[in-house]
Structure formats: C-alpha cells, structure tokens
Amino acid sequence: KAMHVAQPAVVLASSRGIASFVCEYASPGKATEVRVTVLRQADSQVTEVCAATYMMGNELTFLDDSICTGTSSGNQVNLTIQGLRAMDTGLYICKVELMYPPPYYLGIGNGTQIYVIDPEPCPDSD
C-alpha cells in the first residue's frame, strides 16, 4: 500500500559537511515499527546512503559505520548526514516503510537536493 512522504526540496550542507532535513510521512494507521532508508540519486544512479529501523517513540538505529544519525517524533524523522563533500552533492530521497503491524505501507519522497561546497583551505599565515 502506498503512503505519502514529504521532505524539503533543497538543503545546503554546513561548512563542516553536515546536512539535516526532516522526512515526514502520512501514516494511515498506528505503526509501531518503521524502517527509514536514505538513497542518493545522481547521474541516474541510485545508491543507498543509510537505513535504520525504529520502534515508535524510540531512537533510530543505524549501523555502526553509518554516516547518518536521526531522531523520530510522531510521523516525522529528523535525519542528519555527516562527512559530506562537494562530490556528494545530489538528490537524497527518503523512503519510509511501515513494517508492523500489517498492512505494510511504503512511501517514497520526491527527494531533497543537498548541495555541498568544500570549504576553501585556510591560507598559510607567515
């Protein structure tokens, strides 16, 4: 079953290569277990950035080596991606699945264009 997912159109990463955005889904029921996946689309290639599952009201659990962190509040997921560089500029798509209880719902956002600008190196001071 399909579900609507909303996310901002554009986000600018900080000078430290950190970008945050909210992914909001219109839950048709009372989900207790949710899976969130962030995918990057660039040059028609789609790659998985990170994925997490969480029980409603609890923290998101990403893999240890994940570049993502996040928190949840109701039907909103606050996602933060770290370690971004200019080459990581692209469309970051939020995918939400309501895993339990049945029925299973799937929603895919339109994507957030994240722009990353590498900071200029500090000039040497004599």
Epitope: A2, T37, L39, V46, E48, I93, K95, L106
Partner: nanobody, 119 residues
Framework: EVQLVESGGGVVQAGGSLRLSCAAS????????MGWFRQAPGKEQEFVAD????????YYADSVKGRFTISRDNAKNTVYLQMNSLKPEDTAVYYC????????????WGQGTQVTVQS
C-alpha cells in the same frame, strides 16, 4: 518482461520446515532488493523478510525472526526463504517481490505460493 516465479509451498505439520524459492526471469538485471510478503485469508498483507543487494543486509518481521532465513543467489537471480519451526499462524499465500532500484518501490510480484501449516 521480468517474471517472478515462486515454488516450494505445500502442506506441512506444525514444527516442520519448508524452503520457498523465487526465480526471476526475463532479462539480465540487478535488483536493489528482493523480499517475501504473505497474506492469510481475510487478513492484511504482511511483510515477512527482505534482502538488499548493497550489503546483503537482511530484515525480518518480528513474527518470523529466528525461525525464517532469507538468502539470495545473485548469479541465479533467485531468492530463498527457509522456514523452520512452522506454526499454524504461518499459513498464508507467500508472495515474492523485487525492487529494481531503491526508489521504485516493489516493481515486480510473483503469483504466490500457498503454505499450509497443520496443527
């Protein structure tokens, strides 16, 4: 045209095992993910398990965790569901599904295979 064909369903006694297979045919492709869903009569469709190509990462519904194992053979474009310690409540039609890319949703579905667990 991609086709998913399930096999391996049947009737089994509670506590028994079955191994479902789902073979993809119709072309050369690399799926982002493949998974299993089930639907019992008069009930909503339920997610069972899936596996993502990227890291071979697996995910299971709590109701089957520790009893079912999903695996895939990329060379054969086949996904398997090993079901152990079956319970009567596992009785359902099991459907295989495949995602071509992570942002396409479940693009392809099999026709389903019936699993009946007798007590």
């Amino acid at each position: 045209e991609v086709q998913l064909v399930e096999s391996g369903g049947g009737v089994v006694q509670a506590g028994g095992s079955l191994r479902l297979s789902c073979a993809a045919s119709g072309g050369t492709f690399s799926f982002y993910g493949m998974g299993w869903f089930r639907q019992a009569p008069g009930k909503e469709q339920e997610f069972v398990a899936d596996i993502r190509t990227s890291a071979g990462r697996t995910y299971y519904a709590d109701s089957v965790k520790g009893r079912f194992t999903i695996s895939r053979d990329n060379a054969k474009n086949t996904v398997y569901l090993q079901m152990n310690s079956l319970k009567p409540e596992d009785t359902a039609v099991y459907y295989c599904a495949a995602e071509m890319s992570g942002i396409s949703g479940w693009d392809y579905w099999g026709q389903g295979t019936q699993v009946t667990v007798q007590s």
